[in-house]
């Protein structure tokens, strides 16, 4: 850490200390050094934000947060002489921002979005229960990518929520997924209080659901082979297969982590698929098998999210009934 | 055709407990929310309790808040009213309504009997 | 808490007459009103939602007006089946609340 000054000489307070905020969630405080600082202090800050959350010493005279702009926040920021915690910074200069003006009661609820196969997101979000019912919403999105502020067009309804979707496709860049988008919804005629949210893209990731493309016997055996929604890496997910016999009338899961096609009955070397066995199955009645996939924590934070049922295959013979 | 069907009505005694269930059919349940609402013999109605369509969020009235809890599956597309610390006063038909729109119910139920007496 | 108070409480009419029913808002709620009709011995049905609009199967004679404060329930040649009694429900912010009720009678 930075030398100088004695511990116990207290630094003068930080000076001009503003807040802004860019994009749709990202506020940005800078200031100014301290007037009249010791000369042989190497000048670092101490900042916080009014919970005394997140402590940070640094020697950059700006610090910003990626933070949804639904309450009040705060920071504060003093200066001293070295990296250490332990010596006490100058007077603390708080700033701090509010969110948008209005009725909170207005503000829509439940406001979260899905990134559907990431390739496009999906918000949704109930109306305030203060508000007209014929408020016309507008929801805004921006992310890294994104050189502006964008404007979701195609809103829609689901029973009583509403909803827009706008294209996001994974970009190849080894950082994208570290990134988030920021959403804020709105009224077009600024009755409603703004709501904001911030969706990192390692959650709430949807997957489209696998294709079964091949069932066959050996044995006693079934052998299940699918291919993988596009855009994921098998290992990447984890797979549900459920297996349904019409004569025994059994219903079988079984949750498969791994799902590799080694074994020589499988069709090999085919890109993305994905392979199971399902031991002790009657060849001779007939068998449903349907799948189902999420992403998993080896690659996503969130694991919650199943993909839609694949659609059903079936293999064997039904039975006639005496 | 859309319906919900409550149950689990009954006659208990005051301090006792009691769980109301609502099945629903015919529509999306998960897009919509649910409400309870009360009728004590002879008087009017009473909005007891409401939980969103993905049971995020949930609203009580200030004569039950603390005593009952409301809650969802919606892999079940039922509805449910947990009843603890019953009152003389709760005694009421409890109806379970689907919610529509900005904010109104267009679909009731029969009603369920709740009697607390000792 | 909006209180909604209805009036009249009771009414006794005959057949084929024009009844009308009003709701008070307490304070102003747009248009975040609705009606429904209770028979005796069933559950309410909706009638008039958002103040004036019709809920699909409703007969036409009935028709809701209002916004504001002020709302009226309306009935057209009032028919036998019609008895029952008749609640407003405010729908604008929480607690939901509900008028006391009107009941109406046919002679």
């Known amino acids: 850490g930075g030398g100088g000054a004695a511990p116990t000489e207290t630094q003068p307070p930080v000076t001009n200390l503003s807040v802004s905020v860019e994009n749709l969630c990202t506020v940005i405080w800078t200031w100014n050094p301290p007037e009249g600082a010791s000369s042989n202090c190497s000048l670092w800050y101490f900042s916080h934000f009014g919970d005394k959350q997140d402590k940070k010493i640094a020697p950059e005279t700006r610090r910003s947060i990626e933070v949804p702009l639904n309450e009040r926040i705060c920071l504060q920021v003093g200066s001293q002489c070295s990296t250490n915690e332990s010596e006490k910074p100058s007077i603390l200069v708080e700033k701090c921002i509010s969110p948008p003006e209005g009725d909170p009661e207005s503000a829509v609820t439940e406001l979260q979005c899905i990134w559907h196969n990431l390739s496009y997101m999906k918000c949704s979000w109930l109306p305030g229960r203060n508000t007209s019912p014929d408020t016309n919403y507008t929801l805004y999105y921006w992310h890294r990518s994104l050189e502006k502020i964008h404007q979701c067009e195609n809103i829609f309804r689901e029973g009583q929520y509403f909803g827009c979707s706008f294209d996001l496709t994974k970009v190849k860049d080894s950082s994208f997924e570290q990134h988030s988008v920021q959403i804020m919804v709105k009224d077009n005629a600024g009755k409603i209080k703004p709501s904001f949210n911030i969706v990192p893209l390692t959650s709430r990731v949807k997957p489209d659901p696998p294709h079964i493309k091949n069932l066959s016997f050996h044995n006693d055996d079934l052998y299940v082979q699918w291919e993988n929604p596009q855009n994921f890496i098998s290992r990447c997910l984890f797979y549900e297969v459920e297996v349904n016999n019409s004569q025994t009338e059994t219903h079988n899961v079984f949750y498969v982590q791994e799902a590799k096609c080694e074994n020589p009955e499988f069709e090999r070397n085919v890109e993305n698929t994905s392979c199971f066995m399902v031991p002790g199955v009657l060849p001779d009645t007939l068998n449903t098998v349907r799948i189902r996939v999420k992403t998993n924590k080896l690659c996503y934070e969130d694991d919650k999210l199943w993909s839609n049922w694949s659609q059903e295959m079936s293999i064997g013979k039904k039975r006639n009934s005496t | 055709e859309v319906q919900v069907l409550e149950s689990g009505g009954g006659l208990v005694q005051p301090g006792g407990s009691l769980r109301l269930s609502c099945a629903a059919s015919?529509?999306?349940?998960?897009?919509?929310?649910m409400t309870w609402v009360r009728q004590a013999p002879g008087k009017g109605l009473e909005w007891v309790s409401t939980i969103s369509g993905r049971g995020y969020s949930i609203y009580y009235a200030d004569s039950v808040k603390g005593r009952f809890t409301i809650s969802r599956d919606n892999s079940k597309n039922t509805v449910y009213l947990q009843m603890n610390s019953l009152r003389a006063e709760d005694t009421a038909v409890y109806y379970c309504?689907?919610?529509?729109?900005?904010?109104?119910?267009?679909?009731w139920g029969r009603g369920t009997l709740v009697t607390v007496s000792s | 808490e909006i209180v909604l108070t209805q009036s009249p409480d009771f009414q006794s009419v005959t057949p084929k007459e024009k009844v009308t029913i009003t709701c008070r808002a307490s304070q102003s709620i747009g248009s975040s009103l609705h009606w429904y009709q209770q028979k005796p011995d069933q559950s309410p049905k909706l009638l008039i939602k958002?103040?004036?609009q019709s809920f699909s199967g409703v007969p036409s004679r009935f028709s809701g007006s209002g916004s504001g404060t002020d709302f009226t329930l309306t009935i057209n040649s009032l028919e036998a089946e019609d008895a029952a009694a008749y609640y407003c429900?405010?729908?604008?912010?929480?607690?939901?609340?509900f008028g006391q009720g009107t009941k109406l009678e046919i002679k």
């Open positions: 958002y103040a004036s």
């Open positions: 429900m405010s729908s604008l912010g929480l607690p939901y609340t």
């Open positions: 015919g529509f999306t349940f998960s897009n919509y929310a």
């Open positions: 309504a689907k919610e529509e729109g900005h904010w109104y119910f267009d679909v």
